[in-house]
């Protein structure tokens, strides 16, 4: 038997993936648990096996179809259940009526590349991955640049309040190694949150020309 409080949080990537985390205070000894997704009007359902990510939390990804297929829309509600094996039967540990487009978390931006680099500035572009066409241009981005001797947490956030898949970083130091990350968020959805940060892109500014005032 399982006691204690539990928290069940899921996000939709806007295409064909629902990622869930279930936290349970009470101990679970070698119990098999899964998340079951049952849409309210679609002729499919899906299950994923919860795997431990820490002492008291488990995670899994519901793969609904091909990565770029639009498996759910704004009209859908999905009943999500955490089911744990108890002997020969399954016990419902948590349940929620999940509105996918109210609980969005997109995939991290991909294909970061340096378009142009100079001594003091760098133009960087990226692409969004597996994002629904429903958003049209209703997306925003946050970016951060890691300077030498600093941590990511110390890096100031640059906000792009529109769907702009590039940035021009200014006032950089010549001949210096930097790293850059970006994340994306749709404007839609009451419980929508930022995507994970992209993989960092390392770049180096050009050295100042000899004899020039820098």
């Amino acid at each position: 038997a399982v006691n204690g409080t539990s928290q069940f949080t899921c996000f939709y990537n806007s295409r064909a993936n629902i990622s869930c985390v279930w936290s349970q205070d009470g101990a679970l000894q070698d119990t098999s648990c899964q998340v079951h997704a049952w849409p309210d009007r679609r002729r499919w359902n899906q299950t994923c096996e919860l795997l431990p990510v820490s002492q008291a939390s488990w995670a899994c990804n519901l793969i609904l179809g091909a990565p770029d297929s639009q498996k759910l829309t704004t009209v859908d509600i999905v009943t999500l259940r955490v089911l744990c094996r108890e002997g020969v039967r399954w016990r419902v540990m948590a349940i929620q009526d999940f509105k996918p487009f109210e609980n969005l978390r997109l995939m991290a931006p991909i294909s970061l590349q340096v378009v142009h680099v100079e001594t003091h500035r760098c133009n960087i572009s990226w692409e969004i991955s597996q994002a629904s066409h429903y958003f049209e241009r209703h997306l925003e981005f946050e970016a951060r640049t890691l300077s030498p001797g600093h941590t990511w947490e110390e890096a100031p956030l640059l906000t792009l309040k529109q769907k702009q898949e590039w940035i021009c970083l200014e006032t950089l130091t010549p001949d210096t190694q930097y790293e850059f990350q970006v994340r994306v968020k749709p404007l839609q959805g009451e419980f929508t949150t930022w995507s994970p940060w992209s993989q960092p892109l390392a770049f180096r500014t050009k050295p100042a020309a000899l004899g020039k005032d820098t």
Epitope: R41, R42, Q70, T73, T74, D97, H133
Partner: antibody, heavy 116, light 107 residues
Framework: QVQLVQSGAEVKKPGASVKVSCKAS????????IEWVRQAPGQGLEWMGE????????NHNEKFQGRVTMTRDTSTSTVYMELSSLRSEDTAVYYC?????????WGQGTTVTVSS | DIQMTQSPSSLSASVGDRVTITCKAS??????VAWYQQKPGKAPKSLIY???YRYSGVPSRFSGSGSGTDFTLTISSLQPEDFATYFC?????????FGQGTKLEIK
């Protein structure tokens, strides 16, 4: 087997209201959205709205907002659609239909005639 | 609202013919499209959902295809019972909308 059985034909005067019933059987009533679709004589199909019997959640076509009321009685597995302030252009066959995949099972239709 | 434009509006064909009806959505509806058959005085009958999936009991001569904005219903070899009106339908976003119908008549 899944069945949706609707109430009989109605003749109403302009300005009146009509209430059409749709009794479901052969499946878990609370689980699936029931849609209301109408078809004027010789015309196409027009979606009016939907109700999820389990929760009572409702979505309307804004065209009918304020005139259409959808309710359900879970004890009898029946959904009701009431249309008020009737006018001659509301003369149509009204269908209830279950939404699973698409609109998979349909009632036989209820003819509503609005005439003075 | 999403408009579903069906063509042709009417079509004459013979038993055994291959017939194609098309439907164009005014915006992307992915594969959230269904096709229905309706005979005079009867309720519509479901044929296809999710653009290409046949409901059980629907003959294999009926097939659907398409995604995004362009959709097709094909009847590979017309049977006498197939002469009816056919409607496409999008259920991707509210309000759900239907095509104006294609009346399939005997030549």
């Amino acid at each position: 087997q899944v069945q949706l059985v609707q109430s009989g034909a109605e003749v109403k005067k302009p300005g009146a209201s009509v209430k059409v019933s749709c009794k479901a059987s052969g499946y878990t009533f609370s689980r699936y959205w029931i849609e209301w679709v109408r078809q004027a004589p010789g015309q196409g199909l027009e979606w009016m709205g939907e109700i999820l019997p389990g929760s009572g959640s409702i979505n309307h076509n804004e065209k009918f907002q304020g005139r259409v009321t959808m309710t359900r009685d879970t004890s009898t597995s029946t959904v009701y659609m009431e249309l008020s302030s009737l006018r001659s252009e509301d003369t149509a066959v009204y269908y209830c239909t279950r939404h699973y995949g698409s609109f998979d099972y349909w009632g036989q239709g209820t003819t509503v005639t609005v005439s003075s | 609202d999403i408009q579903m434009t069906q063509s042709p509006s009417s079509l004459s064909a013979s038993v055994g013919d291959r017939v194609t009806i098309t439907c164009k959505a005014s915006q992307n509806v992915d594969t959230d499209v269904a096709w229905y058959q309706q005979k005079p005085g009867k309720a519509p009958k479901s044929l296809i959902y999710s653009a290409s999936y046949r409901y059980s009991g629907v003959p294999s001569r009926f097939s659907g295809s398409g995604s995004g904005t362009d959709f097709t219903l094909t009847i590979s070899s017309l049977q006498p019972e197939d002469f009816a009106t056919y409607f496409c339908h999008q259920y991707s976003s509210y309000p759900f909308t239907f095509g104006q119908g294609t009346k399939l008549e005997i030549k």
